[in-house]
């Protein structure tokens, strides 16, 4: 807290400019009018205020807007955003994607902070759903964003938004999350032809049921082992040896290297030895 002192003669700020960089904290408190600051927020980020000076500027805005900042101020916060607490952010109403992008840019290079998580939560709740543009923006800044959501939160993702999802965005998703995302992806990509469809749906297959895997096995997709190993065990178990052979194509030889790991191990144990022998891989059921 900066104590109240009178502004020295000739130091009253007429505008937010670089001369303020060399003001001490108490001078900023005494000589910068909060309303002036609010109307010239776009200049604040262009001026390299110090960490401690930004505390003073935040204090001024907090006094001016005790119920929360208006979006006209929020979109120009720049480095002041890093001074905000989740409690501050919960008072905001952020509706513009440009505002969201501007604030995420400030946090670039850092892990997702509680402030950013709160900001995103406020933004998405305000929109009512995770639309494609929002998802595009969030996954560009935080590739793991989608997998940080609960299955309940993922249920609000419309199928049209799935087009924005890249394979790496799903790297840390667990089966419960893929269970929610897979049907949406299936719907989103339903009008694509066989090989193109497989390229798009591949990352989501950890949520696919047995009947969809059986259907894929009829389409010469040549699924790689990495994708196969991420399939749900309960979806793989009912597949026949012939179906797995068709599903994997030339990659079927990779089963030998994975024979001790799920779901391959459990699938092998469900097959007749005669059928396994047709693969010529020496798999023992």
């Amino acid at each position: 807290e900066v104590e109240k002192t009178a502004c020295p003669s000739g130091k009253k700020a007429r505008e937010i400019d670089e001369s303020l960089i060399f003001y001490k904290k108490w001078e900023l408190e005494a000589c910068v009018d909060a309303a002036l600051l609010a109307t010239q927020m776009d200049r604040v980020n262009a001026i390299p205020f110090t960490y401690e000076q930004l505390d003073v500027l935040k204090h001024k805005l907090d006094e001016l807007y005790p119920q929360g900042y208006p979006e006209s101020v929020i979109q120009h916060l720049g480095y002041l955003f890093l001074k905000m607490s989740p409690e501050d952010i919960r008072k905001w109403n952020v509706t513009s994607l440009e505002t969201l992008k501007a604030l995420l840019e400030v946090n670039k290079g850092h892990e997702m902070s509680p402030q950013v998580a709160t900001l995103i939560d406020r933004f998405v709740k305000g929109r009512g759903q995770l639309d494609k543009d929002t998802l595009d923006t969030l996954t560009a800044f935080y590739p793991g964003y989608l997998c940080s959501l609960s299955p309940e939160e993922l249920s609000s993702v419309p199928p049209s938004s799935i087009w924005a999802v890249r394979p790496q965005d799903l790297d840390t998703c667990d089966p419960r999350q893929l269970d929610v995302l897979y049907p949406k992806a299936r719907l989103a990509f339903q009008n694509m032809n066989g090989s193109e469809y497989f390229v798009k749906i591949q990352s989501f297959l950890g949520g696919a049921p047995t009947e969809d895997l059986k259907a894929l096995s009829q389409q010469n997709v040549s699924m790689d082992l990495a994708t196969f190993m991420k399939l749900r065990t309960d979806a793989v178990l009912p597949l026949t040896v012939a179906e797995v052979q068709k599903l994997l194509g030339p990659h079927v030889e990779g089963l030998k290297a994975e024979e001790r790991h799920r779901p391959v191990r459990d699938w092998i144990l469900r097959q007749r030895q005669d059928d396994l022998d047709t693969l010529g891989l020496g798999l023992q059921g």
């Epitope: 390299p48 110090t50 400030v106």
Partner: nanobody, 111 residues
Amino acid sequence: QVQLQESGGGLVQPGGSLRLSCAASESIFSNYSASWYRQAPGKQRELVATIARTGSAFHLGSVKGRFTISRDNAKRTVYLQMNSLLPEDTAVYYCNVWDSWGQGTQVTVSS
């Protein structure tokens, strides 16, 4: 937090030059403005120069034309080139990036 390490201080005669360097430990150095402060014995710490992440530089009135702040984001380093040094420039010089501070490097200007 970014770790900062200053170097380049020392004893120099009036009118001489020194170049201070401050190396940062993390790549996010380039996200922030960087500053040099100084503190003379018995005085308050003062901001000498600051450089925005865009490269715009600002200098305290009393050092303008003598001191120049610069940065090399690839090397995660901020510099302070000090020319025409005066006895009143004697102080411990500190590097600052966001909420991180260096340990300080002593600059003494004396004949």
